[in-house]
């Protein structure tokens, strides 16, 4: 009679984490008498996975009824596969012996690889806001995937970015892997509504990549432009001066009027006008009683935006001349040292 062969038909199988893996094994003869055992690995360090005769293997079930007299199928099913189950599994026939069974023949082995999905990518931006023309870094992380091969792309408003660096860890063997990527993005004044997207593609996702997003509204600070203008006279001794605060983001802004360097009024921006690009405009006005001044008046509009150092614009109001509309001076004036820092609300 032909000598028994142990046949493991599958050289390799791939199973998704959480599913069951079926490891096929058949023998070609009922002789010699003796049990089948399954091992992960070979040599002296191999691990027993299933023993037909003894032991408790809660995750392992046999595919066919091993108690049947003529059974030659010793396939097993391992439930709830995790990446830690990866390895080469050997079906080994033992010959009945005393006191111990004697290894008779091994199958060629079945390599089990485990597919595990990457976690949803998490995109994080810089801790502090940055202004247009500055380059900021975004990071994207995803974990727990297997096998190691993975593709990561960056987009800004649908346009693919090229300035990024990606690492997959660990470099060596692991049951699962992590990816970490850092992208550099140059901010523009129009980026309040922009999004940065990190896209991860992996064999387990069947062509439907995972995406993580970050809104540049969390990252960008667009500083305001200021314009101070004198309006036509409202009454004989009163002049209306307005400070137009344009194109700023985020909303948090505090404005202080100074007359000849002395604080006249402080107000926090409210009832803002939103522009199409997501920035805001705001206007503040000051009614100046010209008759209360003997000399010319220097009016300064000082704006503290989002906790940044104050910016200001000044306007010279001529008192000596008969009250009439004055031209505006839009040359930037220095932030006044006499003005105490003011915490805005927004």
């Amino acid at each position: 009679e032909e000598e028994l062969q142990v046949i493991q038909p599958d050289k390799s199988i791939s199973v998704a984490a959480g599913e069951s893996a079926t490891l096929h094994c058949t023998v070609t003869s009922l002789i010699p008498v003796g049990p089948i055992q399954w091992f992960r690995g070979a040599g002296p360090g191999r691990e027993l996975i299933y023993n037909q005769k003894e032991g408790h293997f809660p995750r392992v079930t046999t595919v066919s009824d091993l108690t049947k007299r003529n059974n030659m199928d010793f396939s097993i099913r391992i439930s709830n596969i995790t990446p830690a189950d990866a390895g080469t599994y050997y079906c080994v026939k033992f010959r009945k012996g005393s006191p111990d069974h004697v290894e008779f023949k091994s199958g060629a082995g079945t390599e089990l690889s485990v597919r595990a999905k990457p976690s949803a990518p998490v995109v994080s931006g810089p801790a502090a806001r940055a202004t247009p023309q500055h380059t900021v870094s975004f990071t994207c992380e995803s974990h727990g995937f297997s096998p190691r091969d993975i593709t990561l792309k960056w987009f800004k408003n649908g346009n693919e970015l090229s300035d990024f660096q990606t690492n997959v860890d660990p470099a060596g063997d692991s049951v699962s892997y992590s990816i970490h990527s850092t992208a550099k993005v140059v901010l523009t004044r129009e980026d309040v509504h922009s999004q940065v997207i990190c896209e991860v593609a992996h064999v387990t996702l069947q062509g439907d990549p995972l995406r993580g997003t970050a809104n540049l509204s969390e990252t960008i600070r667009v500083p305001p432009t200021l314009e101070v203008t004198q309006q036509p006279v409202r009454a004989e001794n009163q002049v209306n001066v307005t400070c137009q605060v344009r194109k700023f983001y985020p909303q948090r802004l505090q404005l202080t009027w100074l007359e000849n360097g002395n604080v006249s009024r402080t107000e926090t921006a409210s009832t803002l006008t939103e522009n199409k690009d997501g920035t805001y405009n705001w206007m503040s006005w000051l009614l100046v009683n010209v008759s209360a001044h003997r000399d010319d008046v220097k009016l300064t509009c000082q704006v503290e935006h989002d906790g940044q150092p104050a910016v200001s614009k000044s306007h010279d109001l001529k008192v000596s001349a008969h009250p009439k509309e004055q031209g505006s001076n839009t040359a930037p004036g220095p932030a006044l040292a006499s003005a105490a820092p003011l915490g805005g609300s927004g």
């Epitope: 690995g41 040599g43 002296p44 360090g45 390895g87 080994v92 290894e103 008779f104 060629a108």
Partner: antibody, heavy 122, light 112 residues
Framework: QVQLQESGPGLVRPSETLSLTCTVS????????WSWIRQPPGKGLEWIGF???????FYNPSLKSRVTISLDKSKNQFSLKMTSVTAADTAVYYC????????????????WGQGTTVTVSS | DIVMTQSPLSLPVTPGEPASISCKSS???????????LDWYLQRPGQSPQLLIY???NRASGVPDRFSGSGSGTDFTLKISRVEAEDVGVFYC?????????FGGGTKVEIK
């Protein structure tokens, strides 16, 4: 193809600990045994021990009390530590890969590092 | 431990001629699965050992077919059908059946 590179100090003082690392490049740690073998000057080969990819270790009984082999799969490295060294531990130390795919035995030490000379001297 | 004994200690050879090295083990290396767990290695001068034969008779990848291994149980032989100049060095047998793995003392092959 797979390459192994030993690294560590070439000189160790008597009674101190010898520490060597072997870096595996161009291949996987999985499914292999990772071995340390030494060769004293002008003498034959002596097996120190090995570690399987699943972390199981096997040591030469003559050295077992002084030897620890560990595996860092994430770095594709394995290491040898030998305590209380004496001049008799002076040797070329090789790291090597051992195959296993047929039952309880081993199927050849098929990849070797180039060896690193360790001298034990004060 | 399994003791491995090699002979001869030294083997002067003539290029183109055959050569033979013997290795004996203190216990059988034939496992119940039918494999004999014995390896042969060649260590050329100044180099690391190189695997020639595993499981007694299987040639390792890239090894020229002039090298062959035979034997079973406790007696094993490495044959070189036609020695070449590059074959000089020390040949070692090693049992791979059980730990500790043990080597023979080596056979130094040199050109006459």
């Amino acid at each position: 193809q797979v390459q192994l590179q030993e690294s560590g100090p070439g000189l160790v003082r008597p009674s101190e600990t010898l520490s060597l690392t072997c870096t595996v490049s161009g291949g996987s740690i999985r499914n292999y045994y990772w071995s340390w073998i030494r060769q004293p000057p002008g003498k034959g080969l002596e097996w120190i021990g090995f570690i399987y990819y699943n972390g199981r270790t096997f040591y030469n009984p003559s050295l077992k009390s002084r030897v620890t082999i560990s595996l860092d799969k994430s770095k594709n490295q394995f290491s040898l530590k030998m305590t209380s060294v004496t001049a008799a531990d002076t040797a070329v130390y090789y790291c090597a890969r051992v195959r296993a795919y047929s039952g309880i035995g081993l199927d050849g030490t098929d990849v070797w590092g180039q060896g690193t000379t360790v001298t034990v001297s004060s | 431990d399994i003791v491995m004994t090699q002979s001869p200690l030294s083997l002067p050879v003539t290029p183109g001629e055959p050569a033979s090295i013997s290795c004996k083990s203190s216990q059988s290396l034939l496992y119940s699965n039918g494999y004999a767990y014995l390896d042969w290695y060649l260590q050329r001068p100044g180099q690391s050992p190189q695997l020639l034969i595993y499981q007694g008779s299987n040639r390792a990848s890239g090894v020229p077919d002039r090298f062959s291994g035979s034997g079973s149980g406790t007696d094993f032989t490495l044959k070189i059908s036609r020695v070449e100049a590059e074959d000089v060095g020390v040949f070692y047998c090693m049992q791979a059946l059980q730990t500790p793995l043990t080597f023979g003392g080596g056979t130094k092959v040199e050109i006459k």
